[in-house]
Interface confidence: medium
Amino acid sequence: SGTTNTVAAYNLTWKSTNFKTILEWEPKPINQVYTVQISTKSGDWKSKCFYTADTECDLTDEIVKDVKQTYLARVFSYPAGHVESTGSTEEPPYENSPEFTPYLETNLGQPTIQSFEQVGTKVNVTVQDEWTLVRRNDTFLSLRDVFGKDLIYTLYYWKSSSSGKKTAKTNTNEFLIDVDKGENYCFSVQAVIPSRRTANRKSTDSPVECMGHEKGESRETGHHHHHH
């Protein structure tokens, strides 16, 4: 039988990619459930994930209201089977999260090469612009919309027949590179925010895409499109 003893949550951790933001914590509950609150430094607390037995709470809807704000969350522990009573004045145990600033701290998701097109000795490589849950005027914004010129992409490319890699950079979503005639190339891209000085400065590399593979030969003046 469960008791009414509750323990404070611990190991509160923000997991955020392309602004999709989840707060995680320990422990898996035994005799308790959790409620999460979130606020900005100057704002009021807002409760989310009421009396949940989960050890995570999706706070995306709150942080996308202003991704440049700094947020703090806290996790309250209540006895399992708890029904909020108006007479209770005792504050349940809780733990604060680290501060979280989405614009500075959200991880960059793995990018995808949308297409590449070869014309002569030039190849145009296009990176798919990822949609986020950040809104402006009821419209969802893309990663590029949110970060603007703060976001660049690095292209790694190499001849299929060799391992020597070259790089190119762009602050749009397109690259135009020179290639050797008659050679097939492979491509991979990485999203980067150069102004960041932390481990989340770069995304993981995109899946490698190669000319002349799987979806038809890439003719010298033809097109080779990848749709994901």
Partner: antibody
Framework: QVQLQESGPGLVKPSQTLSLTCTVS?????????WSWIRQHPGKGLEWIGE???????RYNPSLKSRVTISVDTSKNQFSLKLSSVTAADTAVYYC??????????????????WGKGTTVTVSS | EIVLTQSPGTLSLSPGERATLSCRAS???????LAWYQQKPGQAPRLLIY???SRATGIPDRFSGSGSGTDFTLTISRLEPEDFAVYYC?????????FGGGTKVEIK
Amino acid sequence: QVQLQESGPGLVKPSQTLSLTCTVSGGSISSGQYWSWIRQHPGKGLEWIGEIYYSGSTRYNPSLKSRVTISVDTSKNQFSLKLSSVTAADTAVYYCARDTPYYYDGGYYYYMDVWGKGTTVTVSS
Amino acid sequence: EIVLTQSPGTLSLSPGERATLSCRASQSVSSSYLAWYQQKPGQAPRLLIYGASSRATGIPDRFSGSGSGTDFTLTISRLEPEDFAVYYCQQVGVVPYTFGGGTKVEIK
């Protein structure tokens, strides 16, 4: 009745990435359980690799964390394991399992109540 | 990491005898997180006991679990021929979740 089935290559070359998928049938992967990977080296005991919740949040064994990725595809009712830079020491039977939170009389209990049959993975060149 | 130490490593008994298996944790484990499993050669583990003392669905009542804190016990009151197998305890509360090294119950 929920059943789990592991699938993936039985032979992986050293330094490559081991990839396995667990297909959940007879129930939804989004039904509030955690989904784990466990392995068993030949003639040895059981080692927990990590788990994932249907929403995608993960917990990993710190001894393997740098090499492990567990992901979930709710549309296919599957979850997957990737273990990079494998060596012969990763040769084992790999099991997927359901880690169930069970609420009873004011408290929660946790246990792995449904297991796949296991798939043998050999790391060799 | 919570280390679970099972003893004895091997238990040689005859059908009809009583088997007592021990699982000792390196630090206190809530009983809500403690489970016992049975594994036969070539098969996946099978849940026997959860919450340290609750029998899983379909498990005969000759299997019972007890204990709290750092000391847990699985008891098989009268061994049947199908009970000869390896038994593992497990804690699923603190990452990394860990299993004991196993106790092999073999026919004497």
